[in-house]
Interface confidence: low
């Protein structure tokens, strides 16, 4: 959608054209919940809050409102040669029961973050790839963005500054044309280390590469299977420690949230991967908001105090349409002594290969 801020004499000083996806973590009475939603088509510029700024005293700002009290604000700043979105802030209203069902508090929250959105003066900022801005409990992903502030003639400049993600790196091939289903197999995902700590120390250590296997219907009614690698460099990990449940939450690009839940069988003193939940956005899907969950898994099992290790690729089927391929997994949940993996329990696949 296009958003424009004008000054008193009707001249545009900010123009922005983008779509945005939001991923928000919030608390419900039954535990933490994640909601993903897109900037709706009826989002509006808040004219009395947006501003072209005043010479040397204040900077331009674009304030976009939607729903019941949600506002996305882009605050711009400049020097002699460049301008940038110095700060992005998002105000969300947990009493908006459409967006945040069963929220345990009904307050208005504000989160903010600096951004990488910057361009040369008198050039527009252009980014076709997703631009993610991570804030506390919120990730905002801008797609297909054209943004320009400090406009001189009420229209986007012809020249542009492209975002880093859009520039082909020396090692990458140009983007492939749309592929028939199934998609070509991507290379194995990078392995990364994750740990979750609580008041009593570390409750989860994990080292693994993650690949999502998604089957969905596209807008043209064809069914496609895609393999998506979780890129550790573009992933934020968090989680929680509980007596009976340990969670690892991964926020990745494209407003992807992948949640692992580890449970424990008290009688046998074994931990296991009990649940996986995925929320992501698939722009070419008939229903772009892809959600899948299963909380009755029994994978990656080992005795509490030991670690589970598997060099072979493991496939964990979550639903008919979604499975997770886990590469080179080494994981330990609940009891982690000294921040180190304990005795290893190898997976059957590895033992059979020995």
């Amino acid at each position: 959608a296009m958003f424009i801020v004008k000054n008193g004499n009707g001249t545009a000083c900010i123009m922005a054209n983008f779509s945005a996806a939001f991923s928000v973590n919030y608390d419900t009475k039954s535990g933490p919940k994640n909601m993903t939603f897109d900037l709706p088509s009826d989002a509006k510029v808040v004219l009395n809050s947006s501003s072209c700024g005043k010479e040397n005293t204040s900077d331009p700002s674009l304030v976009i409102a939607f729903g019941r009290g949600q506002t996305l604000t882009l605050n711009f700043t400049r020097n002699a040669t460049r301008y940038s979105v110095q700060l992005m802030s998002f105000v969300y209203n947990l009493s908006d029961t459409h967006l945040f069902p069963n929220a345990s508090s009904k307050e208005i929250k504000t989160v903010e973050s600096i951004t990488d959105i910057r361009a040369d003066i008198d050039k527009k900022y252009r980014c076709v790839s997703g631009t993610q801005v991570h804030m506390n409990n919120v990730t905002v992903t801008l797609h297909d963005a054209t943004i320009q502030a400090y406009l001189s003639n009420s229209s986007f400049s012809r020249e542009e500054t492209r975002c880093e993600q859009d520039r082909p790196s020396p090692t990458t091939a140009p983007p492939a044309p749309p592929s028939p289903s199934p998609s070509p197999v991507p290379e194995s995902p990078s392995v990364d280390k994750y740990n979750v700590s609580g008041t009593n120390g570390t409750c989860l250590l994990a080292s693994m590469g993650l690949q999502l296997n998604l089957t969905y219907e596209r807008k043209d009614n064809t069914t496609v299977t895609r393999l998506l690698n979780i890129n550790p460099n573009k992933t934020l990990a968090s989680g929680s420690c509980g007596a009976h449940l340990v969670t690892l939450e991964l926020h990745s690009e494209g407003s992807t949230v992948l949640l692992f839940q580890f449970g424990m069988n008290a009688s046998s003193s074994r931990f296991f991967l009990q649940g996986i939940q995925l929320n992501t956005t698939l722009p070419d899907a008939r229903d772009p908001a892809f959600k899948a969950a299963n909380s009755s898994l029994r994978a990656l099992q080992a005795t509490v105090g030991n670690s589970y290790k598997c060099n072979a690729e493991e496939h964990v089927r979550v639903t008919k349409a979604f499975s997770v391929n886990i590469f080179k997994v080494w994981v330990q949940a609940f009891k982690v002594e000294g921040g180190q993996f304990g005795s290893v329990e190898e997976c059957l696949l590895d033992e059979n290969n020995m």
């Epitope: 019941r68 009290g69 209203n93 009493s95 908006d96 029961t97 009904k106 307050e107 208005i108």
Partner: antibody
Amino acid sequence: QVQLQQSGAELVKPGASVKMSCKASGYIFTNYNIHWVKKSPGQGLEWIGAIYPGNGDAPYSQKFKDKATLTADKSSSTTYMQLSRLTSEDSAVYYCVRANWDVAFAYWGQGTLVSVSA
Amino acid sequence: DIQMTQSPPSLSASLGGKVTITCKASQDIDRYMAWYQDKPGKGPRLLIHDTSTLQPGIPSRFSGSGSGRDYSFSISNLEPEDIATYYCLQYDNLWTFGGGTKLEIK
């Protein structure tokens, strides 16, 4: 805890204006809307409007948009409602209510009685 | 503004009996409906929100249902303290109260 302290009863003459206050405490003032509700024997409960003190934004009911003016003073955490060109129809108890659009977590003030009489 | 049409304006029922009040919205309010009890000299008391969710401390004799534009509120096993005026309130788009229903005991 959340409290809304409203100003005292007012006896005013027809044609005059009255300005009542609602002082908030026990929460972050700029995070919640303050709604105003009229309770009268003839008309029952009527929603007048609301103000979001964070930015002064104030939507009104169509019926009251020329009658009521809502303002907020962040420094004193106080919301004001001014009623103009008063008639006997405006005699009522006026409540301020802290709530975002959801009502389940609403807090009501004790009410301000306005009597319009010559 | 969304309009709320509440009926009946008044009703009379026997102790131990059951009454039902209805409210019709001028447009779909997506179950954002509440019911208040109002007594003279007191502030309004919220009984039900989100169409059917009882507020803490409200007896289960009170109930609500509905969807879209049509909503209803019932009190069963009527007691003397239920004598009051009852109002519906939509809060899907700003707020609008219904006209009220005055309940009397026969």
